[in-house]
C-alpha cells in the first residue's frame, strides 16, 4: 500500500500545535485510504528545507526568498502548490514589485543614480531586495557594506529599519529610520507617501500600493511606473512594467519523489473542508495562536503549480537575478556598453554542430546552448541560460506567453530592401500524392497524416485548428488512422508512422527523421496520405534539389494540394489553394537582451547571410542541406519588425485567436506553466 502521508514541517510551537489540529481534523473528514498529515517540527525554515531535501519531511510553505534558497543545490526543492489571494474567480498568486515615480519627473530606470529613494524597509522584498538587487551592478564600488553603496548611489533615501548612525543618508528622508508604523514613511503606504509628499523621487513598492492609497483614477494618473527597458508606463500597466513578479507564498517539495500529487490532493481536500468560510471547527487560513501559521491568514485557497514549472521559472528571471546579485555579489569586471556574446539555443546534435560552427566563425559573438525540445529552449531563454533562437509562429506564441519578445523576422523573398521589409507570411498547405486522386479536404478521416511537429504553425496549429472547427473535439489521433506528429505522446497513433529509433521516435527535433517541413514531406513520400507543410516544401525537395536518397528522384508534378473547398490544385497554385497564411519564423529573446540580440544578429547576417555566394568554402548562416537548422534554409535575411515588436502584434490578431481556440487541445506543459504566471 503506498504511503499517503504528507509530513508537514512546522517552525514553531504554535505552528506545531496548528499542524496537529490540521492532522486531526483531516482524519475526521477524509476516508482512511485518502491522504493524511503528519507533523515534523524544526527550528527554522532553512532546517525545514534541509529536512525535506533529506526526506525527513515532505512539505512546507515559504515566501519567495526562501523558495529561492530551497531551489539552490543541494536542496533542489520545487514549488508544487501556491496560495492565492482575492477571489476564486480572479485568484492572485503573485504580486509585482514596481518603481513608482511622478509623471513629470522625466528620468528612466537607468538614470536613478543621484535621485532620492523611498523604500518600504531594509531587507524587504519589493522595497529593498528586488530594486537593490537589480541595481546592484550599477552601485559604486566597494559594494560591501551594501547599505553604504546604496547610500552613495542615491542622493538621499528613506529606508526604514536601516542603521541611521552608520548610514545617515539612508534615513535622510525619514529622520530616525523607525522600523514600525510610527515612522510615517514605513511599509508600502509609507514609501508611497514619501514619494507623494515630494520627499523622494522614486518609491519601491508593490503594484497594489498605489491603488490602495489613491482611489481616484485622476490622482493615480499623476504617477507612472519605471520599466526595466528604460521606458515608462501608466500605473495600471504593471503586468508589462515591473521590476519583478513575485510569488506570495508557496508550498515546496522535493523535485524527485516529492509526492507533489499527494500534497495537492491533501491541500485540495483541506481547502474544500477547512478553507475560507467552510468550517467553524478548524480554519486552514486562520491563526488563533499567532499569525500566518503554516499558511498566510490572508490566503483564500490553493492552486496547483503546473508540473513543468521549476523554481527558476516560478520566481522569474528578474527576481532570480536580483536575489542572486545580492547573495553572490558578483558583477562583470566593469560594466560596459558592449554586448555580451549571444547564447543561441540549439535543438539536438545537428543544430548544435551548426551552432558551434557559427560560434567559431563569429569570433566570440555567438555561444551555443543545447536543449532537446523547442519548449526546453524557450525555458532556457526565460531563465537566462540561453538568449535567443528562431521559432515557428506557433512557438512564437508560446514564447510570447512566457514573456519573450520577437526581435527579427525571417524573410523568404529576395528583395532590394530585405532587412527593412518584414513579409506578410508564407502559406500553410496540405499536400497529397497525385496518384491518390480520390483524397480531398473533406474525406481525410481515417487517413495517415504527416505533421512538422505538434504546436507548429503549418504542420499543426492551422490544419488542426480548421479540423477542430469541423469535429469539435481534440481527439485528432482518433480522426487520423495513424500519423507522425513529433511531440505527440509516444503511445499515440500520431507517433505510429514516425521513423526515429528508440527514444528518438516522435521526438520534436532532428533526431526524428520525419520532423520539420522536410521530415513531414518525407513521411508523405514514404508512408503517409497527407502532409501539412509550407508552400515551398515540395519544390525545395523535388527536381533533384534535395540530394538525399529518398528525395533525389522526386518530381513536383507527382504531388497536389488540397483546397478547403474540396478541390485539388497543382503545387505551384498555392496562392489559390492553401489552408491559411502563416506568420514567418522569428527570432525571440528576453526583453533585456532585445537590443543586443538585434545588433549582433544584424552584424552576423552581414558576415554570413545570403550575400555569401560560396557556401562550400564559407560558413553560411541560412544553409543546412534542407534540414532548416537554426533558421529555415530559404531565409534570405532577418528583417526588422518595426512596430510589430510584441508576439500579438507580430503574429496578428487572426493567428493569435486561432491558436487561442486550439488552447483547449494544447498539450504544451510550458504554455500551462507560463499562463499560470500570467493568466
Amino acid at each position: 500500500v503506498p504511503d499517503k502521508t504528507v509530513r508537514w514541517c512546522a517552525v514553531s510551537e504554535h505552528e506545531a500545535t496548528k499542524c496537529q489540529s490540521f492532522r486531526d481534523h483531516m482524519k475526521s473528514v477524509i476516508p482512511s485510504d485518502g491522504p493524511s498529515v503528519a507533523c515534523v517540527k524544526k527550528a527554522s525554515y532553512l532546517d525545514c528545507i534541509r529536512a525535506i531535501a533529506a526526506n525527513e519531511a515532505d512539505a512546507v510553505t515559504l515566501d519567495a526568498g526562501l523558495v529561492y534558497d530551497a531551489y539552490l543545490a543541494p536542496n533542489n526543492l520545487k514549488p508544487v502548490v501556491a496560495e492565492f489571494y482575492g477571489s476564486k474567480e480572479d485568484p492572485q498568486t503573485f504580486y509585482y514589485a514596481v518603481a513608482v515615480v511622478k509623471k513629470d519627473s522625466g528620468f528612466q530606470m537607468n538614470q536613478l543614480r543621484g535621485k532620492k529613494s523611498c523604500h518600504t524597509g531594509l531587507g524587504r522584498s519589493a522595497g529593498w531586495n528586488i530594486p537593490i538587487g537589480l541595481l546592484y551592478c550599477d552601485l559604486p564600488e566597494p559594494r560591501k557594506p551594501l547599505e553604504k553603496a546604496v547610500a552613495n548611489f542615491f542622493s538621499g533615501s528613506c529606508a526604514p529599519c536601516a542603521d541611521g548612525t552608520d548610514f545617515p543618508q539612508l534615513c535622510q528622508l525619514c529622520p530616525g529610520c523607525g522600523c514600525s508604523t510610527l515612522n510615517q514613511y514605513f511599509g508600502y503606504s509609507g514609501a508611497f507617501k514619501c514619494l507623494k509628499d515630494g520627499a523622494g523621487d522614486v518609491a519601491f513598492v508593490k503594484h497594489s500600493t498605489i491603488f490602495e492609497n489613491l482611489a481616484n483614477k485622476a490622482d493615480r494618473d499623476q504617477y507612472e511606473l519605471l520599466c526595466l527597458d528604460n521606458t515608462r508606463k501608466p500605473v495600471d500597466e504593471y503586468k508589462d512594467c515591473h521590476l519583478a513578479q513575485v510569488p506570495s507564498h508557496t508550498v515546496v517539495a522535493r523535485s524527485m519523489g516529492g509526492k507533489e500529487d499527494l500534497i495537492w490532493e491533501l491541500l485540495n481536500q483541506a481547502q474544500e473542508h477547512f478553507g475560507k468560510d467552510k468550517s467553524k471547527e478548524f480554519q486552514l487560513f486562520s491563526s488563533p495562536h499567532g499569525k500566518d501559521l503554516l499558511f498566510k491568514d490572508s490566503a483564500h485557497g490553493f492552486l496547483k503549480v503546473p508540473p513543468r514549472m521549476d523554481a527558476k521559472m516560478y520566481l522569474g528571471y528578474e527576481y532570480v537575478t536580483a536575489i542572486r546579485n545580492l547573495r553572490e555579489g558578483t558583477c562583470p569586471e566593469a560594466p560596459t556598453d558592449e554586448c555580451k556574446p549571444v547564447k543561441w539555443c540549439a535543438l539536438s546534435h545537428h543544430e548544435r554542430l551548426k551552432c558551434d560552427e557559427w560560434s567559431v566563425n563569429s569570433v566570440g559573438k555567438i555561444e551555443c546552448v543545447s536543449a532537446e525540445t523547442t519548449e526546453d529552449c524557450i525555458a532556457k531563454i526565460m531563465n537566462g541560460e540561453a538568449d535567443a533562437m528562431s521559432l515557428d509562429g506557433g512557438f512564437v506564441y508560446i514564447a510570447g506567453k512566457c514573456g519573450l519578445v520577437p526581435v527579427l523576422a525571417e524573410n523568404y523573398n529576395k528583395s532590394d530592401n530585405c532587412e527593412d521589409t518584414p513579409e506578410a507570411g508564407y502559406f500553410a498547405i496540405a499536400v497529397v500524392k497525385k496518384s491518390a486522386s480520390d483524397l480531398t479536404w473533406d474525406n481525410l478521416k481515417g487517413k495517415k497524416s504527416c505533421h512538422t511537429a505538434v504546436g507548429r504553425t503549418a504542420g499543426w496549429n492551422i490544419p488542426m485548428g480548421l479540423l477542430y472547427n469541423k469535429i469539435n473535439h481534440c481527439r485528432f489521433d482518433e480522426f487520423f488512422s495513424e500519423g507522425c506528429a513529433p511531440g505527440s505522446k509516444k503511445d499515440s497513433s500520431l507517433c505510429k508512422l514516425c521513423m526515429g529509433s528508440g527514444l528518438n521516435l516522435c521526438e520534436p527535433n532532428n533526431k526524428e527523421g520525419y520532423y520539420g517541413y522536410t521530415g513531414a514531406f518525407r513521411c508523405l513520400v514514404e508512408k503517409g496520405d497527407v502532409a501539412f507543410v509550407k508552400h515551398q516544401t515540395v519544390p525545395q525537395n523535388t527536381g533533384g534539389k534535395n540530394p538525399d536518397p529518398w528525395a533525389k528522384n522526386l518530381n513536383e508534378k507527382d504531388y497536389e494540394l488540397l483546397c478547403l473547398d474540396g478541390t485539388r490544385k497543382p503545387v505551384e497554385e498555392y496562392a489559390n489553394c492553401h489552408l491559411a497564411r502563416a506568420p514567418n519564423h522569428a527570432v525571440v529573446t528576453r526583453k533585456d537582451k532585445e537590443a543586443c540580440v538585434h545588433k549582433i544578429l544584424r552584424q552576423q547576417q552581414h558576415l554570413f547571410g545570403s550575400n555569401v555566394t560560396d557556401c562550400s568554402g564559407n560558413f553560411c548562416l541560412f544553409r543546412s542541406e534542407t534540414k532548416d537548422l537554426l533558421f529555415r534554409d530559404d531565409t534570405v535575411c532577418l528583417a526588422k519588425l518595426h512596430d510589430r515588436n510584441t508576439y500579438e502584434k507580430y503574429l496578428g490578431e487572426e493567428y493569435v485567436k486561432a491558436v487561442g481556440n486550439l488552447r483547449k487541445c494544447s498539450t504544451s506543459s510550458l504554455l500551462e506553466a507560463c499562463t499560470f504566471r500570467r493568466p
Epitope: D356, S359, V360, N361
Partner: nanobody, 112 residues
Framework: QVQLVESGGGLVQPGGSLRLSCVAS????????VIWYRQAPGKQRELVAL???????NYRESVKGRFTISRDDAKNTVWLQMSALEPEDTGVYYC??????FGQGTQVTVSS
Amino acid sequence: QVQLVESGGGLVQPGGSLRLSCVASGSGFGINGVIWYRQAPGKQRELVALIKSDGYTNYRESVKGRFTISRDDAKNTVWLQMSALEPEDTGVYYCKTPGVPFGQGTQVTVSS
C-alpha cells in the same frame, strides 16, 4: 598572413587509423577555434570536428567515438586522430580557422 598546412593523409584499409595534423604559420592561430572539414568527390564539403579555444569539442554524428580532435597551442597545431575508418570517410580533409583561407587539404582514402 597565417597559412594552414594539413598533412597525415594516405591510403588505409577499413578499420585502420590515421592521424592528421594542421599546422599554422604565424601567431594567434586557433584563438577562436579550429574546424576540420572533408569533401568527398561530387559531394558538399562537410564539417567533421571542431575544437574551440577553451578545449570544447564537437563532432558530426557519423564520426563520434571514432575520431578525436585535439590541439597544442605551443606548437600551433591541431590534430585529428581517426580510427575504425570506413570507406565513407574517404575525401580531402581541410582545417579552417576564421579569417584564414582553406589550405590544400590532405587526401584520405579508405579502401580494401
